[in-house]
Structures are given as structure tokens and as C-alpha cells.
Interface confidence: low
């Protein structure tokens, strides 16, 4: 069965720093999402070989990619406190397969000692299903937007 290997399990970084998240699969996928989990999960990026990556506007200009969709390293730059959270890779195959998640802890530089990662990987056993529909915010040219749950006029 298809699996997604994701690393690191957890990382603590100061505000303004960068973090690398690597998503590896055995191939045979159509594309890969990086999804920020939480009460309202958000798709951060969609990456597909041969296609210009789509990045959520909150991370526009702060994401770099290296490798291919089968072994993708996503670099998030200029991290902010609000970027703290668990990020999971989702491989789009015949079925959707999730990685184990990466907990990113963004801290004020002087408080790093109080916030450290434990050795245990984040749990990925209860990941939410992708939401449907989308809400339309203020116009922004070619803005890539996550889809919060919302009713849709079409099936």
C-alpha cells in the first residue's frame, strides 16, 4: 500500500527562521498537498510535477520546493508565530494517503528553551477529511485559497 514518509516529526525554530519538511512516497501519485491541521484545516500548497506549484496566499513568497513530487522538500521561510502548527503531507493517489505530520513550533528567540520538541511523532490517526466548497474573500489576483467548509451552489 502507498505510504507517505514525512520528516521531521517536530522542529522548534525562532521567528523569522526557515524549516524544511520532506515528504517521500513510493511513487505513482498525481500530486501532493501540504496541509496545516487544526480546527479549520488549510491546504498550504499543492505540488505536481510539471505544474507551477499553487501556494496559499498566506505563504505566498515564503515557500520553496526541491526534488520531485515523489520526494519533495518544502521549505517554509520567514516563519511567524501564527505558523505554529502541525503540517501533514497528503499524497493524492487512487486513495488519499497522509504522512505522520510535522509539528512546527515557532517561538520568540528568547523563549526557545521553554518550547522544545519531544521525541514522539505527532499522531496522524484522526486526520480530518478534506472540506468541500469554498468562500470568496476580497478579490486578489490569482490568489490560491484554502477551502473552508461552505455550502456550494453546485454538486
Amino acid at each position: 500500500a502507498q505510504e507517505v514518509q514525512q520528516s521531521p516529526h517536530c522542529t522548534t525554530v525562532p521567528v523569522g527562521a526557515s524549516v524544511n519538511i520532506t515528504c517521500s512516497t513510493s511513487g505513482g501519485l498525481r500530486g501532493i498537498y501540504l496541509r496545516q491541521l487544526g480546527p479549520q484545516p488549510q491546504d498550504i500548497i499543492y505540488y505536481e510535477d510539471g505544474v507551477v506549484p499553487t501556494t496559499d496566499r498566506r505563504f505566498r513568497g515564503r515557500i520553496d520546493f526541491s526534488g520531485s513530487q515523489d520526494n519533495l522538500t518544502i521549505t517554509m521561510h520567514r516563519l511567524q508565530l501564527s505558523d505554529t502548527g502541525t503540517y501533514t503531507c497528503q499524497a493524492i493517489t487512487e486513495v488519499n494517503v497522509y504522512g505522520s505530520g510535522t509539528l512546527v513550533l515557532v517561538t520568540e528567540e528568547q523563549s526557545q528553551g521553554w518550547h522544545r520538541c519531544s521525541d514522539a511523532p505527532p499522531r496522524a490517526s484522526a486526520l480530518p477529511a478534506p472540506p468541500t466548497g469554498s468562500a470568496l474573500p476580497d478579490p486578489q489576483t490569482a490568489s490560491a485559497l484554502p477551502d473552508p467548509p461552505a455550502a456550494s451552489a453546485l454538486p
Partner: nanobody
Framework: DVQLQESGGGSVQAGGSLRLSCPAS????????MGWLRQAPGKEREEVAT???????TYADSVMGRFTISRDNANNALYLQMNDLKPEDTSMYYC?????????????????RGQGTQVTVSI
């Protein structure tokens, strides 16, 4: 990056017609679901029409039989022919695409859209 730019909006009297166009660039246009959205001030967003890569269209009930969505994969363009326009069609119209599983309009996640073009229909 993905770029979408709508054109063709304007003012028209009820019963008139307009044709919206949306050239796309920055990605493999033919691989993805496309659609037209609209939103009037103070009103809910409405998906007017979507079109799969095999050119299968889906329409909102409110525009069925009056609007026709089409795509030109060779020229990376999306169109919306709007006939028999009504005052309630007045809105900002947005061209949109959804990144995700290729082909299907049923797996839509990251939405990309243009700045919009205003359509105003007067009595």
C-alpha cells in the same frame, strides 16, 4: 504562478447578452477543472458554472438554459456566454480553477481565481 484574467464584463439591458473570456497561464490548463463564480455585494457567492477537462458542463439552476460555459484547451481560455440577462445577474464574475485531482470538478481544493469583471444588468 497561475494567472487568470477575466474580460468581457460591462453594462447591458435586461434580455441582452455578454461573453466573458478568461485566458489562463502558468499551469497545464487542459488538466484542470475550470469555472465561473459570481458574488454581488452583500450576497452569498454562487458558482455559476463549472467545466471538466472533457468539457462536461455543470450549471447553477439560476442560469440553466441561459448561460453556456466552454473552454478552449488549445488556447488556454475559458468562456461564459450569457444570454437573456436579468437584473439579478448583476454581479462581479470571477474565473476560477481548482488544483487537485486532474480532470474532475468534484475534487476541488486550492482555489485560484482572477480579479473579476463586473456585469451590470439594468431594466
Amino acid at each position: 504562478d497561475v494567472q487568470l484574467q477575466e474580460s468581457g464584463g460591462g453594462s447591458v439591458q435586461a434580455g441582452g447578452s455578454l461573453r466573458l473570456s478568461c485566458p489562463a497561464s502558468g499551469y497545464t490548463f487542459s488538466h484542470y477543472c475550470m469555472g465561473w463564480l459570481r458574488q454581488a455585494p452583500g450576497k452569498e457567492r454562487e458558482e455559476v458554472a463549472t467545466i471538466d477537462t472533457d468539457s462536461t458542463p455543470t450549471y447553477a439552476d439560476s442560469v440553466m438554459g441561459r448561460f453556456t460555459i466552454s473552454r478552449d484547451n488549445a488556447n488556454n481560455a475559458l468562456y461564459l456566454q450569457m444570454n437573456d440577462l436579468k437584473p439579478e445577474d448583476t454581479s462581479m464574475y470571477y474565473c476560477a480553477t481548482w488544483m487537485g485531482l486532474r480532470g474532475s470538478c468534484h475534487d476541488r481544493r486550492l482555489e485560484v481565481r482572477g480579479q473579476g469583471t463586473q456585469v451590470t444588468v439594468s431594466i
